[in-house]
Interface confidence: low
Amino acid sequence: VPRWRQQWSGPGTTKRFPETVLARCVKYTEIHPEMRHVDCQSVWDAFKGAFISKHPCNITEEDYQPLMKLGTQTVPCNKILLWSRIKDLAHQFTQVQRDMFTLEDTLLGYLADDLTWCGEFNTSKINYQSCPDWRKDCSNNPVSVFWKTVSRRFAEAACDVVHVMLNGSRSKIFDKNSTFGSVEVHNLQPEKVQTLEAWVIHGGREDSRDLCQDPTIKELESIISKRNIQFSCKNIYRPDKFLQCVKNPEDSSCTSEI
């Protein structure tokens, strides 16, 4: 039976994907006047050009270079916050601590956050039915290659002290297969980055363990040390209080450990 459309294992392109990307771009350039030079129509054309008419298992970083060029952005290299498996808290933090930036606070990260997209070989159609899953289908799919590309560039730009927020509730607090573990860790530049400081976020109210002693954190420390970058680690026992104290550092309850 001929199949008119390739069926992949992952969800299809987010509905209204082109409109969403364009609208997000316009909104971003309004909110960040330093990016007013960006022509959002050109950004969308470059984004589209990276995956339309291409086999969705054969996407390369090269395909995204025109988009990367248009989205070039300078963020303070010593104010970078990486995260792994704890995106929401990281974003809540940078919304309060406005001088720090996650990847999703940059134009390209903001455009693609939480979206899925893919095309079809030799047609100009966007596939709204299904897209390749990283594990079940292929790793060189449009979404995975995009995040690998922007994550690598973001890590390469970092300097001085780089912070990373890690989820202490997961079995692998540091996961070598995450974007942080497989891409960002290996693209921090030792000649620019002095220290990687991990913030391990505790999930349970009564959890008073020192998760900085977790074997996966020790593994991260080993990887980082071998790259001639210093490593430090802090437990964030009370993430709610942590955010509250970022908002109101003068609060008397914020002098104790959080």
Epitope: V26, P33, C40
Partner: antibody
Amino acid sequence: EVQLVESGGGLVQPGGSLRLSCAASGFTFSDYGMHWVRQAPGKGLEWIAFISTGSSNIYYVDKVKGRFTISRDNAKNTLYLQMTSLRAEDTAVYYCARNYVSSYGYFDYWGQGTTVTVSS
Amino acid sequence: DIVLTQSPASLAVSLGERATISCRASESVDNYGISFMHWYQQKPGQPPKLLIYRASNLESGIPARFSGSGSRTDFTLTISSLQAEDVAVYYCQQTNKDPLTFGGGTKVEIK
């Protein structure tokens, strides 16, 4: 069809206040940044204020800062300009203008304008 | 603030002839290889209308006789063959830096 219709202009004494409105139709108002631009009689154009889609970013020209307030109500598809401590030099036709879709700061649609006269 | 100086202040051109308007900025309005200079046309009793954006891009619906050129501080709007309906005041505008500023305008008339 995109339409912007200003209202609220009129004659006001120096030191007085006025609130201008701009009713938008024919497009998704909440997707566009909006501006106010004015034109004194027989003179050129002067940009005075901008408000982003969700009102999180607002910019003014220095000479109106502290006196004028730009705001918007996306539910009502309406842009506002609250003007206080009005001076004779604020006399002008006030236009609301829609921010161009793909870059900050220039305008693809304008209203017909509303006239503000500040005089004793 | 970036000051935009237009010249001439007024211009009389015969029908079918070329009209050229200059706009000079007090500092560069270029950034990332893009010129943030735009041109508007304003006819008597009407609001302005966008003609050219980012120095040389023709806004949709605008006749091809209008063109824009230039970079950094020096920009030109050209009407290749003036028509009666082109009688208007033309303004340049920069959006490279806040506050957004306009030139003083150039009045184009029929000779």
